[in-house]
Amino acid sequence: LEASEEVELEPQAPYWTHPQRMEKKLHAVPAGNTVKFRCPAAGNPTPTIRWLKDGQAFHGENRIGGIRLRHQHWSLVMESVVPSDRGTYTCLVENAVGSIRYNYLLDVL
């Protein structure tokens, strides 16, 4: 192969790269603590990740303190959790070939 030639990768639906990091489904966190959900994934083309809370698109705009979305880490971080943060958080990972999702549960104690 010449240096200028690129190897074309086969299209691949998203898949979890570290499912062992997603084993804990329910996070029970004392109020005021920080919670982090991760959905590390890969695919071709590189998939995108978006988050839902209780089935609705979640960007944190109505949450005091907002949220941190670290796309390169496939993560959602919420600091200083409060009881209203309780719910089901879904990561939705998609590319042109397919999509996968995973549900986390958050309980605030």
């Epitope: 804990k24 489904k25 329910l26 029970a28 004392p30 309780r86 719910g87 549900n103 309980d107 104690l109």
Partner: antibody, heavy 119, light 107 residues
Framework: QVTLKESGPGILQPSQTLSLTCSFS??????????VSWIRQPSGKGLEWLAH???????RYNPSLKSRLTISKDTSSNQVFLKITSVDTADTATYYC???????????WGQGTTLTVSS | DIVLTQSPATLSVTPGDRVSLSCRAS??????LHWYQQKSHESPRLLIK???QSISGIPSRFSGSGSGTDFILSFNSVETEDFGMYFC?????????FGSGTKLEIK
């Protein structure tokens, strides 16, 4: 109110497959955050967690028994099932199903069904 | 797997005594520790969740404490109906595991 009730064959011979049913009422396994586990207890001994199924069909198994276990659910009929293949005398126990809702503790338990494995 | 060690294995007490049961985890489990009571020929009953959270319908004489690896279930004044087996359970990681139990008996 919430109730769960286990049913099973009572007696099996070694190498047979155990099929258990947990019939419940008072809650729905389509509710986000809901889950049901199977737990067993040999007579006079401690509790051993076997398998768990969530509302979204996510499943967890005890690794020491995983190759022999299959958990499933029928949301519409409010039932959870457990199959254990190749039973042996060590599987003689009382089998419980228990509910978990937005917790990882079990707030409601069935009365248990007893299995004896004997040739 | 996380191993839960309960002590003592058997505790003989008199009604009215203050009692503490111990559950120690083989590694840190944060607050993911729950307590159950089981009477002879009955199903377990949840007493305390997440180390210290009370459960609706459970008498207030039961309380829990601890975090990390060491946990305590306390009774501020044991009643005759409290005699039986007590199990702890962790849910910090799969597989969920139970302690081997403490038998609370009448002296």
């Amino acid at each position: 109110q919430v109730t769960l009730k286990e049913s099973g064959p009572g007696i099996l011979q070694p190498s047979q497959t155990l099929s258990l049913t947990c019939s419940f009422s008072g809650f729905s396994l389509s509710t986000s955050g809901m889950g049901v586990s199977w737990i067993r207890q040999p007579s006079g001994k401690g509790l051993e967690w076997l398998a768990h199924i969530y509302w979204d069909d996510d499943k967890r198994y005890n690794p020491s028994l995983k190759s022999r276990l299959t958990i499933s659910k029928d949301t519409s009929s409010n039932q959870v099932f457990l199959k254990i293949t190749s039973v042996d005398t060590a599987d003689t126990a009382t089998y419980y199903c228990a509910r978990d809702y937005y917790a990882s503790s079990f707030d409601y338990w069935g009365q248990g069904t007893t299995l004896t494995v004997s040739s | 797997d996380i191993v839960l060690t309960q002590s003592p294995a058997t505790l003989s007490v008199t009604p009215g005594d203050r009692v503490s049961l111990s559950c120690r985890a083989s590694q840190s489990i944060s607050n993911y520790l729950h307590w159950y009571q089981q009477k002879s020929h009955e199903s377990p009953r949840l007493l305390i969740k997440y180390a210290s959270q009370s459960i609706s319908g459970i008498p207030s004489r039961f309380s829990g404490s601890g975090s990390g690896t060491d946990f305590i279930l306390s009774f501020n004044s044991v009643e005759t109906e409290d005699f039986g087996m007590y199990f702890c359970q962790q849910s910090n990681s799969w597989p969920f595991t139970f302690g081997s139990g403490t038998k609370l008996e009448i002296k």
